[in-house]
């Protein structure tokens, strides 16, 4: 799913207030809901009919530093006999997510949001024929 | 996938620099990679063997304001005959993502990162028997 562009009003103060300095805002360092947990079934990446592998990318100047990307293992889907059925397609499910980028020039540290496209897993779909007009 | 807790050093300046005021940092207002696009196959939510619906939640004090959640349509998966096969399970694929929360008290505006658990879609898995020890 696509994250829309940030509205120019999002970072502004209410109209009745004095304007903020252009270009930066105050970011509180705590993270809301930091302890909430993913409640996903176990090992779905290997038990799925459209299985996938994970690759981890690491960047110490990004939060989260670790971003995990899924890659579908097959073009087709795995049938009840454990064989690849190419009448179906394994396709990635993608999600735009935000990360926090740390930038420093000497002793000046600032942060900026960054959009990252994450492939979260794969699903098995019926392909459709494209009829040329 | 789970986002780890933010390390206490992430918001700190290099050791040789004077310390920052506790609790807040400078957030640049632009967003890096704002124009990148999701390149997902069309209508996969309806073509999947584990189809799903979308629900949109809206919050003007959050960026992105719109967060889309998927819900699997069936307990089982759709077979080649279009029937629900309950020997398989439709299960949600979840992803922890970050959003930016806007907080204002009068004319004071600050921002804070918030973790949100998003169900991105569904995949079809083979259930396994839990063997009692």
């Amino acid at each position: 799913r696509k994250i829309p562009k940030v509205g120019h009003t999002f970072f502004q103060k209410p109209e009745s207030c004095p304007p903020v300095p252009e270009g930066s805002m105050k970011l509180d360092t705590g993270i809301i809901n930091e302890n909430q947990r993913v409640s996903m079934s176990r090992n779905i990446e290997s038990r799925s009919t459209s299985p996938w592998n994970y690759t981890v990318t690491w960047d110490p100047n990004r939060y989260p530093s670790e971003v995990v990307q899924a890659q579908c293992k097959h073009l087709g889907c795995i049938n009840a006999q454990g064989k690849e059925d190419i009448s179906m397609n394994s396709v990635p499910i993608q999600q735009e997510t935000l990360v926090l980028r740390r930038k420093h020039q000497g002793c000046s540290v600032s942060f900026q949001l960054e959009k990252v496209l994450v492939t979260v897993g794969c699903t098995c779909v019926t392909p459709v024929v494209h009829h040329v007009q | 996938r789970k986002i780890p807790k933010v390390g206490h050093t992430f918001f700190q300046k290099p050791e040789s620099c004077p310390p920052v005021p506790e609790g807040s940092m400078k957030l640049d207002t632009g967003i890096i990679n704002e124009n990148q696009r999701v390149s997902m196959s069309r209508n996969i939510e309806s073509r999947s063997t584990s189809p799903w619906n979308y629900t949109v939640t809206w919050d003007p004090n959050r960026y992105p304001s719109e967060v889309v959640q998927a819900q699997c349509k069936h307990l089982g998966c759709i077979n080649a005959q279009g029937k629900e096969d309950i020997s398989m399970n439709s299960v949600p694929i979840q992803q922890e993502t970050l959003v930016l929360r806007r907080k204002h008290q009068g004319c004071s505006v600050s921002f804070q990162l918030e973790k949100v658990l998003v169900t991105v879609g569904c995949t079809c898995v083979t259930p396994v028997v839990h063997h009692v020890q």
């Epitope: 009840a80 | 020997s87 028997v129 839990h130």
Partner: antibody, heavy 123, light 107 residues
Framework: EVQLVESGGGLVQPGRSLRLSCAAS????????MHWVRQAPGKGLEWVSG????????GYADSVKGRFTISRDNAKNSLYLQMNSLRAEDTALYYC????????????????WGQGTTVTVSS | EIVLTQSPATLSLSPGERATLSCRAS??????LAWYQQKPGQAPRLLIY???NRATGIPARFSGSGSGTDFTLTISSLEPEDFAVYYC?????????FGQGTKLEIK
């Protein structure tokens, strides 16, 4: 000892409501999907409803859809069945049963059953 | 929905004899068939799942076979405690369904 104990059954008039409960013990409740299965007097078994470990996936038999609601409270190791708009044909012994699947998913085969609670719908 | 038809409705045998119970599905259920035993006044007990796998704690005299539409539960040598009603159940297509039962009685 692995055990399921149902309660909440009774005699109720058509159109009224009843809430059944099932208390689980002896196993990690939130590791498993749970089901309600009923048996009309002198008849066979009929699957009624099922719920996965975190209540994210729920299913109902057509005969009860829109009238019955299954739910669970993992903190209390309890399963529930809210039965509204009851009909004479809902008269049965209602069993709570544990699914055999790992990871709280559905296998739809059930290896632990309670002794049942009787629901009688009659005017 | 898939209809499961069990036969015979009643089977009269003596202890020590071999019992063969049948379950036929209205369409293929692959191997996704289970067998349950129910004694009077008791809850059902899972015997066999996926056509031929014995559930935990089930004696070896119980065995299941078949795939597609025709399935068999065999009790190799009947014990007095085996006289009960037996149900088959499919988990192939929505909704899960049970057969009407076979009553195994002492001859």
């Amino acid at each position: 000892e692995v055990q399921l104990v149902e309660s909440g059954g009774g005699l109720v008039q058509p159109g009224r409501s009843l809430r059944l409960s099932c208390a689980a013990s002896g196993f990690t409740f939130d590791d498993f999907a749970m089901h309600w299965v009923r048996q009309a007097p002198g008849k066979g078994l009929e699957w009624v409803s099922g719920i996965n470990w975190n209540s994210g996936s729920i299913g109902y038999a057509d005969s009860v859809k829109g009238r019955f609601t299954i739910s669970r409270d993992n903190a209390k190791n309890s399963l529930y069945l809210q039965m509204n708009s009851l009909r004479a044909e809902d008269t049965a012994l209602y069993y709570c049963a544990k699914d055999i699947a790992a990871a709280g998913e559905f296998y739809f085969d059930m290896d632990v059953w309670g002794q049942g609670t009787t629901v009688t719908v009659s005017s | 929905e898939i209809v499961l038809t069990q036969s015979p409705a009643t089977l009269s045998l003596s202890p020590g004899e071999r019992a063969t119970l049948s379950c036929r599905a209205s369409q293929s259920v692959s191997s996704y068939l289970a067998w349950y035993q129910q004694k009077p006044g008791q809850a059902p007990r899972l015997l066999i799942y996926d056509a031929s796998n014995r559930a935990t704690g089930i004696p070896a005299r119980f065995s299941g076979s078949g795939s597609g539409t025709d399935f068999t539960l065999t009790i190799s040598s009947l014990e007095p405690e085996d006289f009960a009603v037996y149900y088959c159940q499919q988990r192939s297509n929505w909704p899960p369904t049970f057969g009407q039962g076979t009553k195994l009685e002492i001859k």
